[in-house]
Interface confidence: low
């Protein structure tokens, strides 16, 4: 079951899925000046069996010199600083990291893909939030959101996170020094 809307927005924070539940779709978007190849996949799909999951289908972009494209913006893969770069056009995924059963890792880039990745999450998906550079986290609770099904409708739980500028000194009583990111994840792993 696909989640109806996007995870909630938190001021000065970005979210990131550390793994993607089977059924998650990623649109095959191309940078400006490029378009999907004819007969190419519209999306990549996280699929698998009980023991392994991986990205099915493949995204491929081709030059659209002969045709204008709309709403397709992006730098080359190596310019995409805000995303982990496990790169490959066909849907291979890193395999030396511990895998969550029924989940896929971050899909690898493809040549000339768009900057912004458009995911279609499924019920049960969890995303983690962290403050953008220049802001620090004041935690009231979990800095994560889960897509849940309630009374036949999907909704995202509200992450309990406030991001405050480094110049501000306000801190909740008894709060420990906040960590940069959940479970010590690299600061570079940010928005989806």
């Amino acid at each position: 079951e696909l989640c109806d809307d996007d995870p909630p927005e938190i001021p000065h924070a970005t979210f990131k899925a550390m793994a993607y539940k089977e059924g998650t779709m990623l649109n095959c978007e191309c940078k400006r000046g490029f378009r999907r190849i004819k007969s190419g996949s519209l999306y990549m799909l996280c699929t698998g069996n009980s023991s392994h999951s991986s990205w099915d289908n493949q995204c491929q972009c081709t030059s659209s010199a002969t045709r204008n494209t709309t709403k397709q913006v992006t730098p080359q893969p190596e310019e995409q600083k805000e995303r982990k770069t496990t790169e490959m056009q066909s849907p291979m995924q890193p395999v030396d990291q511990a895998s969550l059963p029924g989940h896929c890792r971050e899909p690898p880039p493809w040549e000339n893909e768009a900057t912004e990745r458009i995911y279609h999450f499924v019920v049960g998906q969890m995303v983690y939030y962290q403050c953008v550079q220049g802001y620090r986290a004041l935690h009231r609770g979990p800095a994560e959101s889960v897509c849940k099904m309630t009374h036949g409708k999907t909704r995202w739980t509200q992450p309990q996170l406030i991001c405050t500028g480094e110049m501000e000194t306000s801190q909740f009583p008894g709060e420990e020094k906040p960590q940069a990111s959940p479970e010590g994840r690299p600061e570079s792993e940010t928005s989806c």
Epitope: N49, E87, M88, S90, P91, P94
Partner: antibody, heavy 122, light 104 residues
């Protein structure tokens, strides 16, 4: 020691099919993609397809979609490629190769099989 | 589909000489890999992600390039370097036609 041992040479008639194998050892078979590569006599390398042994997902070079069928046997850590409707154009050495990636995430073929020679002749 | 063109097809060199072979892509790519193959043997990974030497590759080899032009250079050719070298696009697995390095 990581190894990919391929099956022996095949002499087949035009129109027939042939299946070759690639037995992996020295690593966890289900954790790495297996690729197949064709090399005609005196020619260059041509990528055919890959299979992920963990779940059987495959991806093909368009030129080989109707020619090759990939499968795996997880229990014997063996990958298979079936070539059908053979013609003289299919006479070649076929390699299996394991894909790995460097820290930048750039995938490459780090271990290659010994190669299987297929000769199509009447 | 990315097309990789290698030149020259055959490169003749004397021992100790410096040689460079080129791999050109039909459109801009992020990285390419190089493989070495000797007659009757399987290809071996030689240089990955444009400039990283694979395990066991002598330091006289180097790789460079960006965009549509990449090269493999041997600073001082030795007899054991005689082989065919193939470039490969990291992202679609397309191979170039190969450059055969032969010793005079």
């Amino acid at each position: 020691q990581v190894r990919l041992q391929q099956s022996g040479p095949e002499l087949v008639k035009p129109g027939a099919s042939v299946q070759m194998s690639c037995k992996a050892s020295g690593y966890t078979f289900t954790d790495y993609y297996i690729n197949w590569v064709k090399q005609r006599p005196g020619q260059g390398l041509e990528w055919i397809a890959w299979i992920f042994p963990g779940n059987g997902n495959t991806y093909f070079n368009e030129n080989f979609k109707d020619k090759a069928t990939l499968s795996v046997d997880k229990f014997s850590s063996t990958a298979f490629m079936l070539l059908s409707s053979l013609t003289s154009e299919d006479s070649a050495v076929y390699f299996c190769a394991r894909a790995t990636y460097d820290h930048g995430g750039y995938w490459y073929f780090d271990v290659w099989g010994t190669g299987t020679t297929v000769t199509v002749s009447s | 589909q990315i097309v990789l063109s290698q030149s020259p097809a055959i490169l003749s060199a004397s021992p100790g000489e410096k040689v460079t072979m080129t791999c050109r892509a039909s459109s801009s790519v992020s990285h390419i890999h190089w493989y070495q193959q000797k007659p009757g043997s399987s290809p071996k990974p030689w240089i990955y992600a444009t400039s990283n030497l694979a395990s066991g590759v002598p330091g006289r080899f180097s790789g460079s390039g960006s965009g549509t032009s990449y090269s493999l250079t041997v600073s001082r050719v030795e007899a054991e370097d005689a082989a065919t070298y193939y470039c490969q696009h990291w992202n679609s697995f397309t191979f170039g036609g190969g450059t055969e390095l032969e010793l005079k």
